[in-house]
Amino acid sequence: MAVTACQGLGFVVSLIGIAGIIAATCMDQWSTQDLYNNPVTAVFNYQGLWRSCVRESSGFTECRGYFTLLGLPAMLQAVRALMIVGIVLGAIGLLVSIFALKCIRIGSMEDSAKANMTLTSGIMFIVSGLCAIAGVSVFANMLVTNFWMSTANMYTGMGGMVQTVQTRYTFGAALFVGWVAGGLTLIGGVMMCIACRGLAPEETNYKAVSYHASGHSVAYKPGGFKASTGFGSNTKNKKIYDGGARTEDEVQSYPSKHDYV
């Protein structure tokens, strides 16, 4: 039950995280104009990964896409790449984890397969979260560097004549969304990995050994009680829980109409 809960919670947390990463990637407010020097500006600038925008006090907002690849800073391209990789890995992870969920039965998928899928999706979520955190952190570092550079030479112009007051940019809402979303995806991935351990404890290879008990003898074949079930013989080693007190077949619930989603 705890394993199912951990797996389910990990899935939900990762889902929220990935939705957040997608939202952050699409948001325009990665960097916003620093209003420290001009708190009553009638023009507010903000920039995203894909376009820059200007919001006037009149309510009019104009956004322009970055219609160039070669002209963009390498760091911005790197951040875009990290975020996209994070989204792709996260999406694949979600797809895999849906089939790995213990509460969902797909045909006669065994727990070992579900455990592997849970681990795979968990690792994907962790990498996805790390990509998002890395992407946002790289962008934040770029902002900090540019901020102090523009502060150092606040006024740019020729011959000492003040021409343009440089616009300084500070952290936008998307950065915080990205950090939180990346963290959630990472946490969700860790939870999936923990759930995987619960689904697949250490395998013990049981050899065909005869145990002589008083009165009668029982030969334990590889595969536990599989031979005695109506599903036919199974020659694969099966995991036996609680020191062999009961096999997974004893606790296995048979497919019902509610199991298929």
């Epitope: 023009v43 200007v54 006037e56 009149s58 309510g59 104009e62 021409q163 007051v165 616009t167």
Partner: antibody
């Protein structure tokens, strides 16, 4: 057709109060920021106050800060300017104006005259 | 506050002749985000409210004759009338629309000779 009609002007004694109104029609009032601009007799234009479309942002000129209050009723398509502690230097024609892109004032009312005198 | 200084304060022009009004701001009105200058020009005819002529320093408002043109960037701006007509008389104002308070210039009175 866009129309802005100011009202509420008149003669008032120094220290008195007055409430100006600006009735808007011909456009979606709730989508536009609005301003009050004044012009003293024979003088130039002086910006007075601004209110954003949803009343979230309000700015005042230093000369009226603390004495004047701008507000709006989007349901009634009306802009207001509550003027308290009036001084002789507040005597002017008060115009309401609509805010448009470029942060420009594209439509102006005909103005209402406020005279502060004892 | 941004101080707007207009020159000349008065101008007398013969119909058909060009006219030019200068406007200087104490701070740059150029917004780096969209590379637009937040300066607006208005014309106030006698007994009327002001009328919008040009915004973003050079964009003509719809319905404004093409003889009116705006130019300049940063702190120096100019309004040009290619051929002055009798109906162009009035006071021309430039306005800072970059930061509050949205200050106006003192105005330039255009008269016909």
């Amino acid at each position: 057709d866009v129309q802005l009609v100011e009202s509420g002007g008149g003669l008032v004694q120094p220290g008195g109060s007055l409430r100006l109104s600006c009735a808007a029609s011909g456009f979606t009032f709730s989508s536009f920021g609005m301003h009050w601009v004044r012009q003293a007799p024979g003088k130039g234009l002086e910006w007075v106050a601004f209110i954003s479309s949803g009343s979230h942002t309000i700015y005042y000129a230093d000369s009226v800060k603390g004495r004047f209050s701008i507000s709006r009723d989007n349901a009634k398509n009306t802009l207001f300017l509550q003027m308290n502690s009036l001084r002789a230097e507040d005597t002017a024609v008060y115009y309401c104006a609509r805010f448009q892109y470029g942060n420009s004032f594209d439509y102006w009312g005909q103005g209402t005259l406020v005279t502060v005198s004892s | 506050d941004v101080v707007m200084t207009q020159t000349p304060l008065s101008l007398s022009v013969t119909p058909g002749q060009p006219a030019s009004i200068s406007c200087k701001s104490s701070q740059s009105l150029l917004n780096s985000g969209n590379q637009k200058n937040y300066l607006t020009w208005y014309l106030q005819k006698p007994g009327q409210p002001p009328k919008l002529l040009i915004y973003w320093a050079s964009t003509r408002e719809s319905g404004v004759p093409d003889r009116f043109s705006g130019s300049g960037s940063g702190t120096d701006f100019t309004l040009k009338i290619s051929r002055v007509e009798a109906e162009d008389v009035g006071v021309y104002y430039c306005q800072n629309t970059y930061s509050f308070p949205l200050t106006f210039g003192q105005g330039t009175k255009l008269e016909i000779k």
